[in-house]
């Protein structure tokens, strides 16, 4: 079982376990997302991402989730008994991100730039919202992220 984001291979992650961890946390912790008209991971961010581009984009998105979303969500988790599931999700994101080594070759600049523009669409949408609202929405959209990542999962 492995992810293949273009030439970037990731082993040691069982995708259904990520879904299970996400559902456990979301069903226990997730507060109401009242702004349903806005999506952070909008279709333009994830639509028709090439294999080569996927390595850059996955790296950027997972890094953001770890450093911004999960880090700030941890305080919410403390009140509930789902730390194990939250840790499963976060630790697997770390495992994936640590194995993603996007090429720094100059020939890949157009591809990395395209991935960066996609990521910026997401980050801008996040920053336009109140911090608390943005965190709730971003965590709620982990399912959109996992759905996209699933396309690169091989058995």
């Amino acid at each position: 079982q492995e992810f293949r984001f273009g030439s970037c291979q990731v082993t040691g992650v069982v995708l259904p376990e990520l879904w299970e961890a996400f559902w456990t946390v979301k069903n226990t912790v997730q507060t109401q997302d009242d702004i349903t008209s806005i999506r952070l991971l909008k279709p333009q961010v994830l639509r028709n991402v090439s294999g080569a581009e996927s390595c850059y984009l996955a790296h950027s998105l997972l890094k953001f989730y770890l450093n911004t979303v999960f880090k700030n969500y941890h305080s919410k988790i403390a009140k509930f008994k789902v730390l194990r599931s939250f840790s499963t999700l976060a630790n697997n994101f770390i495992v994936i991100m640590s194995q993603l080594q996007p090429s720094k070759d100059n020939s890949m600049l157009p591809i990395s730039e395209s991935a960066h523009q996609r990521f910026l669409l997401f980050r801008r949408a996040f920053k336009q919202l109140d911090t608390e609202v943005a965190l709730v929405k971003a965590f709620g959209e982990v399912d959109i992220l996992l759905t996209w990542m699933q396309k690169f999962y091989h058995l």
Epitope: P16, W19, E20, W23, P43, R47, I144
Partner: antibody
């Protein structure tokens, strides 16, 4: 050899109940999500329910929510579907299925059990 | 709720290429699966995650998924490929597995 064998089907009157079982063998049952899917006579496939490895999360189609309950006994390698308040439109062949391992991919299916709801 | 749309029937001459499509809003961002079902039998998965073949499925079966359409291609269709084919995806917003209505493939 991987096998999924459904049982518990039969005829029942509207408003009645049935409990379907699916006996699994040939794989590590506790490692896989399981599903129930049905097919009414001459119709297409309709997903009913999904249960995760430890039963911690369950999901249902709107058509059966509140009436059907999915469960599993990992010690017995068995999947269940408790069906209450049955209606004539629940008449169908009921299949259990095993996830391929990637999630949301019904990699192996049983042969199905017939459920008929009729007065 | 999320819907997947398939044309009810497709015909193909033996040894020719058959294409069966599955339409859904931005289905390209989801993983699409395909199942084959012959009369009186349980369905069999022929494609998962858009384009991957489970072991035991002939190479003539392939899949693609982009934009609003997922496609199952059977290159060099055989008489034994005559069956109903269903596409399927996961709708994360409704937490539901969704099947298309099915396409009956006739091999002439």
């Amino acid at each position: 050899e991987l096998q999924l064998v459904e049982s518990g089907g039969g005829s029942v009157q509207p408003g009645g109940s049935l409990r379907l079982s699916c006996a699994a063998s040939g794989f590590t049952f506790s490692n896989y999500w399981m599903y129930w899917v049905r097919q009414a006579p001459g119709k297409g496939l309709e997903w009913l329910s999904l249960i995760t490895t430890d039963g911690g999360s369950t999901f249902y189609a709107d058509s059966v929510k509140g009436r059907f309950t999915i469960s599993r006994d990992n010690a017995k390698n068995t999947l269940y579907l408790q069906m209450n308040s049955l209606k004539s439109e629940d008449t169908a062949v009921y299949y259990c299925a095993k996830d391929l391992g990637s999630g949301f991919s019904l990699g192996s299916w049983g042969q199905g059990t017939q459920v008929t709801v009729s007065a | 709720s999320y819907e997947l749309t398939q044309s009810p029937s497709v015909s193909v001459a033996q040894r020719q290429t058959a294409k069966i499509t599955c339409g859904g809003d931005n289905i390209g961002s989801k993983s699409a699966q395909w199942y084959q079902q012959k009369p009186g039998q349980a369905p069999v998965m022929v494609i998962y995650s858009d384009s991957r073949r489970p072991s035991g499925i002939p190479e003539r079966f392939s899949g693609s998924n982009s934009g609003n359409t997922a496609t199952l291609t059977i290159s060099g269709a055989q008489a034994e490929d005559e069956a109903d084919y269903y596409c399927q995806a996961w709708d994360s917003s409704a937490n539901a597995v969704v099947f298309g209505g099915g396409t009956h493939l006739t091999v002439l």
